[in-house]
């Protein structure tokens, strides 16, 4: 029977895309015999003549491309992959954003500075609002060879967590377990979309038990 070759990358079911941009849906698959792929929009066969500007189907790439998307492109897009031994399907939802998007907004006051006891667990919250898919990162300022900044003046940071959020409103958390003095320092919650960047710095202080 057919199977997905990149199932771990197919968990993003919603694409929120500003109008005029290009969208590509992909369902990379394999099987023996080599399966075929077809596409549905809102449960019905989807062909190029169904949209102004047409579509690009790349069977070898398991992909459907729509250039210059408009609000009428909103809907559920399903790939159906089948051979004589069975079929599998995946549905993506496309939302086309008509309003011009803004850079991400971080809720004021979050994340808050915290003081923690050695060996305790700490959790930071960051609330991100973005009408275009944001790339969210938790970062920590670090020193390299005793310096906090590189030769070009850019601060040295290490990426603790990084992912692309699917929701317009994301309540994200950074959990640090069994903190040591090394965990103390300055951190960042950073959210980026194609318009710009928003970030908030915060501090963790770690001290011994009183």
């Amino acid at each position: 029977a057919p199977y997905w070759t990149r199932p771990e990358r197919m968990d993003k079911k919603l694409l929120a895309v500003p109008a005029a941009n290009t969208v590509r849906f992909r369902c990379p698959a394999a099987g023996n015999p080599t399966p075929s792929i077809s596409w549905l929009k809102n449960g019905r066969e989807f062909r190029g003549e169904h949209r102004i500007g047409g579509i690009k189907l790349r069977h070898q790439q398991w992909s459907l491309v729509m250039e210059s998307v408009v609000p009428s492109d909103r809907g559920n897009y399903t790939c159906v992959v089948e051979n004589k031994f069975g079929s599998i399907r995946q549905t993506y939802t496309l939302d086309v954003l008509e309003r011009a998007p803004h850079r991400p907004i971080l809720q004021a006051g979050l994340p808050a500075n915290q003081t923690a006891v050695l060996g305790s667990d700490v959790e930071f919250h960051c609330k991100v609002y973005s009408d275009a898919q944001p790339h969210i990162q938790w970062l920590k300022h670090v020193e390299v060879n005793g310096s906090k900044v590189g030769p070009d003046g850019t601060p040295y940071v290490t990426v603790l967590k990084s992912w692309i959020s699917e929701s317009v409103e994301a309540d994200v958390r950074l959990r640090l377990a069994n903190v040591s003095e090394r965990d103390g320092g300055e951190y960042l919650c950073r959210a980026t979309n194609f318009i710009g960047v928003a970030e908030k710095a915060f501090w963790l202080s770690v001290h011994g038990p009183r």
Partner: antibody, heavy 126, light 109 residues
């Protein structure tokens, strides 16, 4: 027809500033960002920065941070790039380009430049 | 920040196949765009999202991207393909555009 038309060639002295314009036509200006890319004689393409035509947000390559300013005037669908404290190494052709977003269900979002201006030659010489 | 490596030059006889490479650490996890620049002209987008051709770009051009190498292939090379070819990625960590150094294609004869 979608096009970007840039201002004419400039000759500047070291230490001076230059401001290059890029007028867009044939599409909705605020739906796409504008990038600036330069090319020194015989060299490759070097990205300088980009601007959101919607809200004016900017993002610059570290190399040009503090020396370049990119702005837009939505009333005339024009983007501008100003480079200050010019040196001889800034002699190059400067291009503006429309930034298009590509959203992929597996790889996320990526940006490229689908329409380019004709280029503006800036010569820095004493 | 991503670093993209391209061989500086490539020579191909007419009618043969030109293969441009763009090397980068785990570049297969990113999407790559390709531009062609003819002498004295502005760059032109010839491939986006690794494999997609903009309208007006001939089917002789194709792309792929796996592991540490992205590839642009031109079959049945013609004299008019002579140009510089640049790969480009979007570095989502810094929100910066990154170009490869470019490859100059010379069509022999």
């Amino acid at each position: 027809e979608v096009q970007l038309v840039q201002s004419g060639a400039e000759v500047k002295k070291p230490g001076a500033s230059v401001k290059v314009s890029c007028k867009a036509s044939g599409y909705m200006f605020t739906s796409y960002g504008i990038s600036w890319v330069r090319q020194a004689p015989g060299q490759g393409l070097e990205w300088m920065g980009w601007v959101s035509t919607y809200n004016g947000d900017t993002n610059y390559a570290q190399k040009f941070q503090g020396r370049v300013t990119v702005t837009t005037d939505t009333s005339t669908s024009t983007a501008y790039m100003e480079l200050r404290s010019l040196r001889s190494e800034d002699t190059a052709v400067y291009y503006c380009a429309r930034v298009l977003g590509y959203y992929d269900s597996i790889d996320g979002y990526y940006y490229g430049m689908d329409v380019w201006g004709q280029g503006t030659t800036v010569t820095v010489s004493s | 920040q991503s670093v993209l490596t391209q061989p500086p030059s490539l020579s191909v006889a007419p009618g043969k196949t030109a293969t441009f490479t763009c090397g980068g650490n785990n570049i297969g996890d990113k999407s790559v765009h390709w531009y062609r620049q003819k002498p004295g002209q502005a760059p032109v987008l010839v491939m986006y999202l690794d494999t997609e051709r903009p309208s007006g770009i001939p089917e002789r051009m194709s792309g792929s991207n796996f592991g540490n190498t992205a590839t642009l292939t031109i079959t049945r090379v013609e004299a008019e393909d002579e140009a510089d070819y640049y790969c480009q990625v979007w570095d989502s960590g810094s929100d910066h555009v990154v170009f490869g150094g470019g490859t100059k294609l010379t069509v022999l004869g």
